[in-house]
Interface confidence: low
């Protein structure tokens, strides 16, 4: 006869570990008892339980309520036991010794491996701003046994670097994702993917990238010369920019206060029926938490009664 067992039994932390020990013998052979022991390199062999064909299961008090036989129906040649609620301290070598009649005794050893599934955490890096060099976007840390694998899933171009810290019964892996911030990365997902044999499927944590930027400002509205004549209505100047966070707009006149009747509505400056008083240098000031930009234009309102005068349009930033 021979013992059927496993070299390695793998179980997830908190689950029940089945320690297999099945005697494969001739039909007339019987199993009298199965002795289970923990084999510790320092403490030697420590009895776990004794499974007797006649007297049933006797468990070492140290393992009371933790060692059981598998649920029925049971094969009389099956000396397997269940170790309930496996913890990391249970990891190690176990031995089953089977006494049979008339073939004698057999023994086998196996290693119990307790997988500790990781609970990953993702930490965003410092605020990202366009114009920075290679910057930490996020770091992801997972600790488990054995060491988990930590990778990144994203369409964003960047670099990944990992480091491990080994503890007595586990290992922590931290992976960092660095990138050169660009406004095109705004709203893009950056996903930390943690793989581990104790997980049924990869754990994923997603961080949405936010990159602060402010585009150059420019002013539109002076393209049609006919609009900028005395008496014309509906003349507007519009300040063009974009940013993250969204920018605020402010309009001023360089050579004095805004004329009466000129309305500021966010990025747009609206004029009442034009007079020569509306000629001047207008400045659009765009700002957000990151930066500020200015664009200025010179408006000259043409008086049709003065045919010698042309509309002079100058735009400068």
């Amino acid at each position: 006869g021979e013992l059927e067992t496993s070299d390695v039994v793998t179980v997830v932390l908190g689950q029940d570990a089945k320690l297999p020990c099945f005697y494969r013998g001739d039909p007339d052979e019987q199993v009298g008892q199965v002795a289970w022991a923990r084999v510790d390199p320092n403490e030697g062999i420590r009895e776990l339980a004794l499974l007797h064909s006649k007297y049933g299961l006797h468990v070492n008090p140290a393992y009371e309520d933790r060692v059981e036989q598998p649920p029925p129906p049971r094969d009389p040649l099956d000396g397997s036991v269940l170790l309930r609620n496996a913890v990391q301290a249970d990891e190690g070598e176990y031995e089953c010794r089977v006494s049979t009649f008339p073939a004698g005794s057999f023994q086998a050893r196996m290693r119990l491996r307790v997988l500790v599934p990781p609970l990953p955490s993702l930490n965003p890096g410092p605020p990202l701003e366009e114009g920075q060099g290679l910057t930490l976007a996020a770091s992801c840390t997972a600790e488990g046994s054995p060491a988990p694998s930590v990778t990144w899933d994203t369409e964003v171009k960047g670099t990944q670097s990992s480091r491990s810290f080994t503890h007595p019964r586990s290992a922590a892996v931290t992976s960092e994702f660095h990138l050169v911030p660009s406004r095109s990365m705004n709203g893009q997902p950056l996903t930390c993917v943690v793989s581990h044999p104790g997980l049924l499927q990869d754990r994923r944590i997603t961080h949405t990238l936010q990159v602060a930027f402010l585009a150059e400002a420019s002013v539109r509205g002076l393209e049609d010369q006919n609009l900028w004549q005395v008496g014309r209505e509906g003349a507007t100047l519009k300040c063009l920019s974009e940013g993250q966070p969204p920018p605020k707009y402010n309009w001023t006149r360089l050579d004095g206060p805004l004329p009466s009747g000129v309305r500021v509505k966010g990025d747009t400056l609206g004029f009442p029926p034009l007079t020569t008083e509306h000629s001047g240098v207008y400045v659009c000031h765009v700002s957000n938490e990151l930066s500020s930009r200015d664009s200025q234009v010179t408006v000259e309102v043409l008086d049709p009664e003065d045919p010698g005068k042309q509309v002079d349009l100058v735009s400068a930033s």
């Epitope: 059927e4 089945k18 649920p71 694998s149 793989s195 044999p197």
Partner: antibody, heavy 116, light 107 residues
């Protein structure tokens, strides 16, 4: 997403050997077992064995101990099964599958025909 | 090795019918049983693991139950796309063994 891409169909002569490949992608190759399963035309499924790429441990069912050899190449995330001394009984579709215990992702299968 | 006896071998049903397939293990396999679906010309697909847990994305008309030696797989309301062969498998101890399969055909 997880994918197992197997090599194409094989036509070999009796007595020869063949090596079938299974390239894994979409997960960490070294943290899951790769199992191999045989299916003869119109028949059921027969487990051959597994390899754990993390430490290259292997386990075979008794019928395949002298027939199949399982290997893995971590650098290319590819598992291989070599079948030797082929006979017509080895003509079948062979699948690789990922799993810890049950098999959650399968390759598309490789058809092996042994014929003179 | 553990023998998984699966019944019936064939099932001819109409769309909307309830279907039950059973698998009996030759010795206790705890709840370490999986069920797979294999459509014509395709590789098997995991439906149920640990006897009663549906895999990700598997419709809830597929259910499994059982413990020890007797296991049941049910399709509560068969759809046309369920035409396939269904296999049980024990992953309690090596060698992992499969049932002989049940071929489901739609009238």
């Amino acid at each position: 997403q997880v994918q197992l891409q197997q090599s194409g169909p094989e036509l070999v002569k009796p007595g020869a050997s063949v090596r079938i490949s299974c390239k894994a992608s979409g997960y960490t190759f070294t943290t899951y077992y790769i199992h191999w399963v045989k299916q003869r035309p119109g028949q059921g499924l027969e487990w051959i064995g597994w390899i754990y790429p993390g430490n290259v441990n292997t386990k075979y069912t008794e019928n395949f101990k002298d027939k199949a050899t399982l290997t893995a190449d971590k650098s290319s995330s590819t598992a291989y099964m070599q079948l030797s001394s082929l006979t017509s009984e080895d003509s079948a579709v062979y699948f690789c599958a990922r799993g810890l215990y049950y098999f959650d992702f399968w390759g598309q299968g490789t058809t092996l025909t042994v014929s003179s | 090795s553990i023998v998984m006896t699966q019944t019936p071998k064939f099932l001819l049903v109409s769309a909307g019918d309830r279907v039950t397939i059973t698998c009996k293990a030759s010795q206790s396999v705890n709840n370490d049983v999986a069920w797979y679906q294999q459509k014509p010309g395709q590789s098997p697909k995991l439906l149920i693991y640990y006897a009663s847990n549906r895999d990700t994305g598997v419709p809830d008309r597929f259910t499994g139950s059982g413990f020890g030696t007797d296991f049941t797989f049910t399709i509560s309301s068969v759809q046309a796309e369920d035409l396939a062969v269904y296999f049980c498998q024990q992953d309690y101890s090596s060698p992992y063994t499969f049932g002989g399969g049940t071929k489901l055909e739609i009238k």
